[in-house]
């Protein structure tokens, strides 16, 4: 049943669910700071547009009575609990800044008719794709699968002359929330990635991964995994790796590769890192003092969620349109708005578009260098370094299947 | 976090979750009547044992603010919501008469540390197996798989001389809650049924089912489905059926086959019905006036849940043992107690044992007749009719794979 909204003449509120379970282990104060910084910006923008309205956030905290707290694995019902709390308190805003956990978001759409817009800093899983009132401000799994398929198929670059159609995927179940859903999407038999590959095998044990590195009978030279370099090192250590192995390390929300004085450790030489273009964002922001490089994206997504709310509010108010309508609820998509750190584009399904960056380790400088970028909005790969100083033979990526001649 | 319990000197309460979403579309008044009838009996039994204590039930209703109501598909969080309500109201009893929906029960165990006993009239799915504080009073899916495997392997009865190792399973997603989980268990690749079969295929479309009935190239003669005769008729109609096809219709909670003057329709001649021995229970009970044959088992499970609570209370009080201990929470298993309709046995995992009954349609009398019974407690099949008047050739069940000779 519907919840009455605090969203009427001159007073507009965004309800921010402050979850015990979160996609990133971020103190709730930091999230609150990000939201408040966003509100300051929104107020200024509305005032400049001659819109004398009040904009606030109501923070709805879990009471912690029931749920196992911590990560997203036990978050399924927390979003619904908070929605009930909002409902009882009659404090629903115009927009819900909702759960970051996929389970929680999915359950909210499964169990209720959400007729107001929901913005999420997370909800990475395929099960949250194509929700008509959901906007996701951190790259969802679907976007990753599109990049990988595009890259696998690419065969006309100086450094990649073979199409690939095979892959191993390493997934041991201890991954962070973003990685968990990214790898789930690669594993899922219904996903675009699985659909486009002729061979794919999920490696679940450390030993399976370690054995593949030198296995002459391996079915693919390419291994996709998700995490940071430390995660890879714990798994791979200093083991020898066959020369035509390529590890794709997905580490989207980690700016450390772009920091000054970062040197790539030797174990990264067979690795291509997939990450995102960093902004300088938050480096000198009032609320970002305590944020690690991996946390910036999460806080930024909350801040941008508030700016998106402000953008939509401004657009509708300027057009004299009602905010509490299905039109408003379905409008948070297929648009570009000014985010905290530059333009933010949402696709037709309300999912953020971004520039993904594929890095390699230069054997000369031991630095991470940009090999290519990929624009998720137009599904297009743009080579950057046409003569990379790779570890691989002839400075080209190997074929995904080694030709071993007659057996 | 734990919830304080109304369960101390002289006053003992059972918290009954009254869910909007339920495994059977049973008016909540009927459930309440069953619980109250059970309480009357418990009070009498305790009094007779010289235990002057107060026993009550607190009924916890959903507020209906959030959830899509109705069936179990959108029930995941409703149990947790009610647990929160209990927690806030400080009204937790000694025992929880919990959700009947698998999703809801599973989620409660996933998201919380349930250190008090929970009794369920349902929770049929494999995902609710082996929960240390859960008792299920209606046959769970695991018990069905044990029967089927036992029956498939049986080859030493006058009417079944072939072991079977193949099966089709018809599952179109519109099934009732019990059927949904029974068929899920048969479909699951990890289940005992799947493990023991060499061939199994799930038919999801009506047309697939209909085509198999006369398909010369079918891989099995056996089709398992779940529902009542009407459900089968809608699907099969009066279509011709190959003579060696055997349909197993699982319809555990339906006493109509045993009612006087019931004649089996012609379309049931190729069908074996798996159901349970009916008791006379409820037929002349004060609260059963409005119950259909299919609803009796559900109401009876609630009533028996109360009697089980009373039995455990009596046992612990007579032994001078504390009720609010882990020992009490883990004690609702591996026992037999006096239920409303006779002894009720719970296995080592707190799941009810029962006598399943396999019926066939007599070609002479057009009546449903008992072919065999199966005791889930000892996993044993007991033939009843050694000379059944089957439709199948030589009054024997055919092989599951037709020998078509040289092709």
């Amino acid at each position: 049943s519907q919840v009455s909204q605090n969203c009427h003449n001159g007073s507009y509120e965004i309800s921010v669910l402050m979850m015990d379970n979160s996609a990133f282990a971020e103190p709730l104060e930091n999230v609150e700071d990000a939201v408040n910084e966003g509100l300051e910006i929104v107020r200024g923008r509305l005032q400049n547009a001659g819109l004398n309205v009040t904009v606030n956030a109501s923070f709805m905290y879990s009471d912690g009575l029931i749920h196992n707290s911590g990560d997203c694995r036990s978050s399924t019902c927390e979003g619904l609990d908070l929605l009930r709390k909002i409902s009882n308190a009659k404090r629903m805003g115009c927009v819900l800044m909702g759960p970051s956990c996929t389970y929680s978001t999915f359950q909210m759409y499964l169990d209720t008719e959400l007729s107001y817009p929901m913005i999420s800093a997370g909800s990475f899983g395929l099960s949250c794709d194509y929700k008509e009132t959901l906007t996701r401000l951190m790259s969802p799994a679907r976007k990753l699968t599109y990049f990988l398929v595009n890259f696998w198929k690419t065969n006309d670059l100086p450094f990649k002359t073979y199409s690939w159609s095979t892959s191993y995927v390493y997934k041991n179940g201890t991954e962070s929330e973003d990685c968990f859903w990214y790898l789930n999407a690669l594993e899922a038999s219904v996903s675009y990635f699985s659909h486009e590959l002729s061979f794919k095998l999920v490696l679940r044990q450390d030993k399976e991964f370690q054995d593949i590195l030198m296995d002459h009978n391996r079915k693919s030279n390419v291994i996709v995994m998700c995490g940071d370099p430390q995660f890879l090192y714990k798994l791979k250590g200093d083991r020898a790796v066959a020369e035509d192995i390529v590890i794709i390390l997905v580490d989207l929300f980690n700016d450390q590769y772009f920091e000054d004085n970062v040197t790539a450790p030797d174990y990264m030489k067979n690795v291509l890192v997939l990450t995102q273009s960093p902004g300088n964002s938050l480096l000198n922001s009032s609320f970002s003092r305590n944020l690690s490089p991996t946390k910036r994206d999460f806080a930024l997504a909350y801040l941008n969620g508030i700016l998106l709310f402000g953008h939509m509010l401004k657009t509708f108010l300027e057009n004299g349109e009602n905010i509490t309508t299905p039109k408003f609820a379905h409008a948070f998509r297929n648009l570009t708005f000014e985010g905290y750190d530059g333009p933010v584009t949402l696709d037709d399904w309300g999912d953020v578009d971004s520039t993904m960056v594929l890095l390699y380790t230069s054997v000369d400088t031991k630095k991470y260098k940009v090999l290519l970028t990929y624009d998720t909005h137009v599904n297009q790969t743009n080579p950057v370094d046409m003569s990379p100083t790779f570890t691989w033979k002839n400075s080209k990526l190997p074929n995904d299947i080694t030709d071993r001649g007659p057996q | 976090s734990q919830v304080s319990q109304n369960c101390h000197n002289g006053s003992y309460e059972i918290s009954v979750l009254m869910m909007d979403n339920s495994a059977f579309a049973e008016p909540l008044e009927n459930v309440e009547d069953a619980v109250n009838e059970g309480l009357e009996i418990v009070r009498g039994r305790l009094q007779n044992a010289g235990l002057n204590v107060t026993v009550n039930a607190s009924f916890m209703y959903s507020d209906g603010l959030i959830h899509n109501s109705g069936d179990c598909r959108s029930s995941t969080c409703e149990g947790l919501d009610l647990l929160r309500k209990i927690s806030n109201a400080k009204r937790m009893g000694c025992v929880l008469m919990g959700p009947s929906c698998t999703y809801s029960t599973f989620q409660m165990y996933l998201d919380t540390e349930l250190s008090y006993p929970m009794i369920s009239a349902g929770s049929f799915g494999l995902s609710c197996d082996y929960k240390e504080t859960l008792t299920r009073l209606m046959s769970p899916a695991r018990k069905l798989t044990y029967f089927l495997v036992n029956f498939w392997k049986t080859n030493d009865l006058p009417f079944k001389t072939y072991s079977w190792s193949t099966s089709y399973v018809y599952k179109n997603g519109t099934e009732s809650e019990d059927c949904f989980w029974y068929l899920n268990a048969l479909e699951a690749s990890v289940s005992y049924f799947s493990h023991e079969l060499s061939f199994k295929l799930v038919l999801r479309q009506d047309k697939e089912f209909q085509d198999i009935l006369m398909d010369h190239n079918r891989k099995s003669n056996v089709i398992v489905m779940c529902g009542d005769p009407q459900f089968l008729y809608k699907l099969k109609g009066d279509r011709a059926v190959a003579e060696d096809i055997v349909i197993i219709l699982v319809d555990l909670f339906n006493d109509q086959y045993f009612e006087d003057n019931v004649t089996a329709p012609d379309y049931m001649k190729n069908v074996l019905v798996l159901t349970q021995s009916p008791g006379n229970s409820l037929l002349n009970s004060s609260f059963s006036r409005n119950l259909s044959p299919t609803k009796r088992d559900f109401a009876l499970a609630y009533l028996n849940g109360i009697l089980l609570f009373g039995h455990m209370l009596k046992t612990f009080l007579e032994n001078g043992e504390n009720i609010t201990t882990p020992k009490f929470a883990h004690a609702f298993r591996n026992l037999t107690f006096e239920g409303y309709d006779g002894p009720v046995t719970l296995d080592d995992w707190g799941d009810v044992d029962s006598t399943m009954v396999l019926l066939y349609t007599s070609v002479d009398t057009k009546k449903y007749k008992v072919l065999l019974t199966y005791d889930t407690h000892v996993n044993q099949t007991n033939p009843v009719d050694m000379s059944p008047t089957f439709t199948w050739k030589n009054s024997k069940l055919p092989n599951d794979i037709t020998d078509r000779g040289p092709q």
Epitope: G279, S285, L300, H311, T336, E338, G342, P343 | -
Partner: antibody
């Protein structure tokens, strides 16, 4: 009231450097994206660079690698460091505030003139 | 990024209406609802007249209106007044974080 005041322009030789400043007042400077736009004598407007609230920077292709935009939020000041100046960089340089809607500059300074000539 | 195309000049008598066009591509004007128009009097800084294709900042007379069709945006000035004589520039967001200006149109009030 809300205003922007540019300074730092002047005459400089090709290859030289110059640093422009833009002092903001009357609004919460840190909340806005800030831009530099230039106008060569007798010509149209040309966007040069932007710095967003979060500190992210972007440049027109014509100045990429030579110009650096920065901001000092506590001093309410925007900067443009111009290196390797060329004759074609001669223009009036305006500092402009982003209105929060992409590509809309609602407050402009009066401009400061940069002349690159030997 | 090449600029947007505007007519170099146009004119009209007081009280008349004039329309200035601004033609871009499917990557800028056609792709985004972010076209702005600026007015610049000689020796002065530009002033924002229209943003987001059709929106007017407070203080801008409703004689100024914006529209867009396909890859072309338009500024219409109705009820021309002497003080409307100025240069008019369009600009469009062009993806990434880049924006492009038009070459400008000189409006003369006859």
């Amino acid at each position: 009231q809300v205003q922007l005041v540019e300074s730092g322009g002047g005459l400089v030789k090709p290859g030289g450097s110059l640093r422009l400043s833009c002092a903001a007042s009357g609004f919460t400077f840190s909340s806005y994206s800030m831009n530099w736009v230039r106008q060569a004598p007798g010509k149209g407007l040309e966007w040069v660079s932007v710095i967003y609230s979060g500190g992210s920077t972007h440049y027109a292709d014509s100045v990429k690698g030579r110009f650096t935009i920065s901001r000092h939020n506590s001093k309410n000041t925007l900067y443009l460091q111009m290196n390797s100046l060329r004759a074609e960089d001669t223009a009036v340089y305006y500092c402009a505030r982003g209105a929060g809607t992409l590509n809309a500059f609602d407050i402009w300074g009066q401009g400061t003139t940069v002349t690159v000539s030997s | 990024q090449s600029g947007l195309t505007q007519p170099p000049s146009t004119s009209g008598s007081p009280g008349q209406s004039v329309t200035i066009s601004c033609t871009g591509t499917s990557s800028d004007v056609g792709a985004y609802s972010y076209v702005s128009w600026y007015q610049q009097h000689p020796g002065k800084a530009p002033k924002l007249l229209i943003y987001a294709v059709t929106k007017r900042p407070s203080g801008v007379p409703d004689r100024f209106s914006g529209s867009k069709s396909g890859n072309t945006a338009s500024l219409t000035v109705s009820g021309l007044q002497d003080e409307d004589e100025a240069d008019y520039y369009c600009s469009s967001f062009a993806g990434g974080s880049t924006l492009v200006f038009g070459g400008g149109t000189k409006l003369t009030v006859l």
